[in-house]
């Protein structure tokens, strides 16, 4: 017999972390950001 379809509520297909730094000119500083991207 074929199984009845019971879906799970969600699946995380992939998740990536990207770090970036940006020079802010004469301030000699950096802005560090963390971007989280996920597909649900």
């Amino acid at each position: 017999d074929a199984e009845f379809r019971h879906d799970s509520g969600y699946e995380v297909h992939h998740q990536k972390l990207v770090f970036f730094a940006e020079d802010v000119g004469s301030n000699k500083g950096a802005i560090i950001g963390l971007m989280v991207g996920g597909v649900v």
Partner: antibody
């Protein structure tokens, strides 16, 4: 509050097509995981599952009746339909629709009160 | 089709008794996702079935704790610890692991 209500012709003759409607409230068939099944029960006997329709219009049928069954839905009107062709006296039964709630429950939690269908010449 | 065999078909009890109903399936009800889709319903005369227990042992909302479900694979049991008058009716087990979905023939819980 989830409610379902079945409606049908009451009486029809052999060889005719039975058309049933399940009108529901308290949930939407556009919601991921939701579904509705049709189940029937001859008087004083057991339960027989007929067909199921999912929120995404995927369908499942009882293989023993598949050639005679068509399930469909009107999401905007909160209705599910079942057609049974070439009916015979063996199709005389109370017909129920039931709400299927998916993840994380995966159960048929609420049934309608049923509509009685008699096939007689 | 998966055949659901319930025993007994009739169960005479006195109020306050413990009642036990067995349900056996012709094949394992463990779905490929790991869940076991075995459920119990109570149907009273002139009414539609009402869900009591889902996925073997989970009580549905509002179901008294005198109802409990257990089992695994192909062998399942519904127990009522102290039968009350409102518990009388026909109990059905049901599997939703395979197509077609199937039901047991029912167990009628009645007074002695």
């Amino acid at each position: 509050q989830v409610t379902l209500k079945e409606s049908g012709p009451g009486i029809l003759q052999p060889s005719q097509t039975l058309s049933l409607t399940c009108s529901f409230s308290g949930f939407s068939l556009s919601t991921s995981g939701m579904g509705v099944s049709w189940i029937r029960q001859p008087s004083g006997k057991g339960l027989e599952w007929l067909a199921h329709i999912y929120w995404d219009d995927d369908k499942r049928y009882n293989p023993s009746l598949k050639s005679r069954l068509t399930i469909s839905k009107d999401t905007s009107r909160n209705q599910v339909f079942l057609k049974i062709t070439s009916v015979d006296t063996a199709d005389t039964a109370t017909y129920y629709c039931a709400r299927y709630d998916g993840y994380p429950y995966w159960y048929f939690d609420v049934w309608g009160a049923g509509t009685t269908v008699t096939v007689s010449s | 089709d998966v055949v659901m065999t319930q025993t007994p078909l009739s169960l005479p009890v006195s109020l306050g008794d413990q009642a036990s109903i067995s349900c056996r399936s012709s094949q394992s009800l463990v779905h490929s996702n790991g869940n076991t889709y075995l459920h119990w319903y109570l149907q009273k005369p002139g009414q539609s079935p009402k869900l009591l227990i889902y996925k073997v042992s989970n009580r549905f909302f509002g179901v008294p704790d005198r109802f409990s479900g257990s089992g695994s694979g192909t062998d399942f049991t519904l127990k009522i610890s102290r039968v009350e008058a409102e518990d009388l009716g026909v109990y059905f087990c049901s599997q939703t692991t395979y197509v077609p979905l199937t039901f047991g023939a029912g167990t009628k819980l009645e007074l002695k």
